[in-house]
Structure formats: C-alpha cells, structure tokens
C-alpha cells in the first residue's frame, strides 16, 4: 500500500522537511503533490512524468519544492503556512491510480532565551530570588538547569508562570551556581546563556586554631603562639583580633612570641562580613604558666553571634 | 613602627625589564599582603596585583598578567615586584602598599615609591 | 572589572567651607570604600575603610557616607593641610580599582 512518511514530522521554521513515498506500484508513469488531503487542480504543486522526467509547476508551486524521480517531494525554507497534509496522486498505466496522504508539521523558530533575575546576589536565609526566562512563546515547554543539571527537588524552588519563573525561596550558601533556561518545542530547543548566582552568606561563627611552635600540649612560658582563626563567609570576612578587650590587629593569624604569664587573658576573633550584615565572633581564655603543669587553651569556648 | 622601604629610581630601555625590592619592617612580615601600586606622571593610582608572603600566592592585574612577576624572601622580610617588556607608558612612580588586614581591606601603609623610567 | 568615578574632578573651596567628593562605582560595593588622601610629592594616605570607619589619626572632620554604589567623603570644615588629592578605592576583592582622582585646592 502506498505511503507517505514526513523526515522529519516536526519541522522548524526555515528548515527543509522531505516527504517520501513508500510502496510505489510497479507500472507508474507520473506523479502529481498537492496540498492537502484530496486531489484537487487547484491545490497541484507539481506534476512529473517519468518518462520524460519532467516536473511541471502547479498553482499552489511556491518556488520551494523539488520533486524526485522516486516521487519524493522537498519542500525548503518551511513556513508555518506549510503545516498540513500532503497528497501524492501516482498515475499508472493502467489508469487506475493512487493516492497517499502525509502530513508535517512546522514550528516557530525559537529565539536564544536569556534570563532575568530580581536579585544576583541574595543573602542566605533572608532574600529569595526570582529569575525569568525571557521571551515568552506560546506552545513551548521551558525547562531550567543548575550546574548543568536538570533542577534539584525542594520545596524551596518553585517553577510558576508556565515554568517562565523559577523562584528561590529563602536562598542557601549551596544553591549558588550557574543557572540556564533551555526553550523547547517538538522541533527544536535553544538554552541561554549562563547567569551566575553568588549567594552571600556569613560570616559562620568562626573557629580558632591553635599552632604552638615548638609544638606542645601545653602554653609554656617563652613559646610563640599562633592563633589561626577561621570563618565561612562570602565575601570572605574582615578579621580582627581583641586580647583582653583590646583591639589588636586585622589579620588572620595573631602571632606573639615567647609568651609569658603576661599573656594570659581572652583572645577575641571577630569577623565582619558588610555585604550580609552579619558579625560573629569567638573568645578563648589562654593561660600561660613559667612550669609544665599549664592547663593550655582553655576548651569551652565562648560564641558571641551578632546580626 | 611599619616601614616599607623601596629601591632606588630606574631609568630603562623600552623593551627592557625593572625589578623593584619592598623591604618590609616594624611587623610580622608573613601576616599582611603586599600590594604593588603605580602612578604614572600627573595620573592617577592603579593597582598591579598583590602577593601573601606567607605562601607566595599572587593575584594580578589582567592588564599586567603574562608582563609582571611578584615574589618574596621570607628571610629578609622582602617582597619584589618585576615589570617586564617595558613600554614608554610604564613610566610611573611603583608603590608596595601593605593591606590593612586579611581579606577585603585597603591598603594602610605605602612604600616610599619608585622611580622607573622608561625611555630611548 | 568594577569602575571607580569620582567627582568633581578638581574643587576650590575656602578655609572653613564643607567640602564634598563623591564616588560611584559600577557594582554594589556593600560598603567596602575607602578614601586616600595624597598631597603634593607625597605617597597616598589611607583616611577611612569599610565606607566610614576613620583611620586612628585621621581628624575628625573628614567622615565617610554612602552605601550599594554611591559614596561621600566629607570634609566638614577644610583647612589649609588639607590641600591634596582624594582617591576612592573599593576593597572588596581584587582587582582592586580607584577613582580618577578629586584634587582639592584652597580659594
């Protein structure tokens, strides 16, 4: 039985869609296309007679169409206009002929997307960020991807708009990353590029390490300490250091040489992070004694947390 | 107190390459980052990169990356800013500035600055 | 990379007047601003960071105010020493960019 299949079925506008014929009877000696589901001469795009492998152009010819010697019909530079049936009429010897319809179906070129977004920089636990893939087309399914994966389950994304907005609620320090829409229809897909979210967050209560040179578990008279503190922060935070409610200096490490029971008292890191608005700090009581028997860094830390 | 204090002026060759010397004191030389900051004639500052003592890592300008070079000598408490295939528009006054703090600070003490002069 | 612009690019003022500089930067800074001050032959002196923090040193008729991406240095009452270059920079992160400059001269 003849056929018609349509390569491909789904065409993008401007693309080339090929209409083949499958089960062409043995005696044939021409063959007419024509728009839509019947014979009719108002709808002739082209007629070809095998014999002299000639085509003739019909009233409904555009310009676009080519017709093959297997009775295969191309049709180039697709417009939605060609959405529809396909008739072919093979004529036979015998004057008995067929007809097979196909049909396509074109879709609008998509545009590149991009994405517009309220807020690139969010502050952790407090902003939520909305981004919007932008244009809007009618018939296409929109999809997103973080890191280049297809988007994580959580209650705090939520997909509106006909998944146009993707918001996230009450952003965390983990959801900062590469975000892309990507636009399909049954034709074709097109992703945006790249937008960037830099969530900051911070500054974590910090931590302070102690490094004894020469290393010992104990604070002895006539060692340098050296107090690293730490804090998770983004923006990395602003260091400073108070001994004994005394400001000192604005670095990471506090370093004292050949400390002596002078020296004794609380160690205050603060951090500072002005983009968050956050502060956080830690206090260790540090003794020194002149003996071994030295009790060291005192472990119960206090944590003081402003916002 | 802190002092930072620089080579000498230098009168080069375009084409040529200058190697300035910050000589750090009066702190812990392996706790603040050095800066390498340039003002050309009757301009403005403009910032070349910075190096941690502490580990050698360095961060630079995107307009001087593949022509400049920083490092240090732990030992003399020195850091070294090196300007390579000068041009006549790197003539300027070279300053080492140390960074307040660590992290996010501005620059709080400056070098006495460098002459370099490029010139055929 | 963040754009510094300062203005006005140069002022003359008399002794006791309020002076004004402003800088805009291109990017929100969060408030990681600082002011220098560089008088004739001299190098740059740091005067205030983190927008308005003061500089142990630094008297106090010079003030800081701003915030996101606009900035102001004040001097409230200009006196003679005060005759220099005032630079904005942005501390937040490398590279570390400054404004072109506002020179400052007495009437």
């Known amino acids: 039985k003849l056929t018609i299949e349509s390569t491909p079925f789904n065409v993008a506008e401007g693309k080339e869609v090929l209409l083949l014929a499958h089960n062409l009877p043995q005696n044939r000696i021409g063959y007419s296309w024509y728009k839509g589901e019947r014979v009719d001469g108002n709808s002739l795009i082209v007629g070809y007679v095998i014999g002299t492998q000639q085509a003739t152009p019909g009233p409904a010819y555009s310009g676009r169409e080519t017709i093959y010697p297997n009775a295969s019909l191309l049709i180039q530079n697709v417009t939605q206009n060609d959405t529809g049936f396909y008739t072919l009429q093979v004529i036979k010897s015998d004057l008995v002929n067929e007809e097979a319809t196909g049909q396509f179906h074109v879709y609008p070129e998509l545009p590149k997307p991009s994405i517009s977004s309220n807020n690139s920089n969010p502050v952790e636990d407090k902003d939520a960020v909305a981004f919007t893939c932008e244009p809007e087309v009618q018939n296409t399914t929109y999809l997103w991807w973080v890191n280049g994966q297809s988007l994580p389950v959580s209650p705090r994304l939520q997909l509106s708009n006909g998944n146009m907005t993707l918001t996230l609620l009450s952003v965390k320090r983990n959801d900062a990353g590469s975000y892309e829409c990507e636009i399909q229809n049954p034709a074709s897909a097109n992703r945006s590029d790249p937008v960037t979210l830099n969530v900051l967050y911070g500054p974590d209560v910090p931590t302070i390490s102690p490094i004894i040179s020469p290393p010992d578990s104990s604070y002895l008279s006539g060692a340098n300490l050296n107090l690293s503190c730490h804090s998770a922060s983004n923006p990395s935070p602003q260091y400073s250091w108070r001994i004994n409610g005394i400001p000192q200096q604005h670095t990471q490490v506090l370093f004292i040489a050949k400390i002596t029971p002078n020296n004794n008292g609380t160690y205050a890191c603060f951090v500072s992070n002005l983009a968050t608005g956050r502060n956080n700090s830690i206090v260790k009581s540090i003794t020194v004694s002149a003996s071994g028997t030295s009790p060291g860094l005192s472990a119960g830390a206090h944590h003081h947390h402003h916002h | 107190q802190v002092q930072l204090v620089q080579s000498g002026a230098e009168v080069k060759k375009p084409g040529a390459s200058v190697k300035v010397s910050c000589k750090a004191s009066?702190?812990?030389?392996?706790?603040?980052?050095l800066h390498w900051v340039r003002q050309a004639p009757g301009q403005g500052l403009e910032w070349i990169g910075y190096?941690?003592?502490?580990?050698?890592?360095?961060s630079y300008a995107q307009k001087f990356q593949g022509r400049v070079t920083m490092t240090r000598d732990t030992s003399t408490s020195t850091v070294y800013m090196e300007l390579s295939s000068l041009r006549s528009e790197d003539t300027a006054v070279y300053y080492c500035a140390r960074e307040y703090g660590n992290y996010n600070y501005p620059l709080d003490y400056w070098g006495q600055g460098t002459l370099v002069t490029v010139s055929s | 990379d963040i754009q510094m612009t300062q203005s006005p690019s140069s002022l003359s003022a008399s002794v006791g007047d309020r002076v004004t500089i402003t800088c805009r930067a291109s990017?929100?800074?969060?408030?990681?601003l600082a002011w220098y001050q560089q008088k004739p032959g001299k190098v740059p002196k740091l005067l205030i960071y983190?927008?308005?923090n003061l500089v142990e040193g630094v008297p106090s008729r010079f003030s800081g105010s701003g915030s996101g991406t606009d900035f102001t240095l004040t001097i409230s009452s200009l006196q003679p020493e005060d005759v220099a270059t005032y630079y904005c920079q942005h501390h937040l992160g490398t590279p570390y960019t400054f404004g072109q400059g506002t020179k400052v001269e007495i009437k």
């Open positions: 990017e929100n800074q969060y408030g990681y």
């Open positions: 009066g702190y812990i030389f392996t706790s603040y980052w």
């Open positions: 190096i941690n003592p502490q580990t050698g890592y360095t």
């Open positions: 983190n927008t308005k």
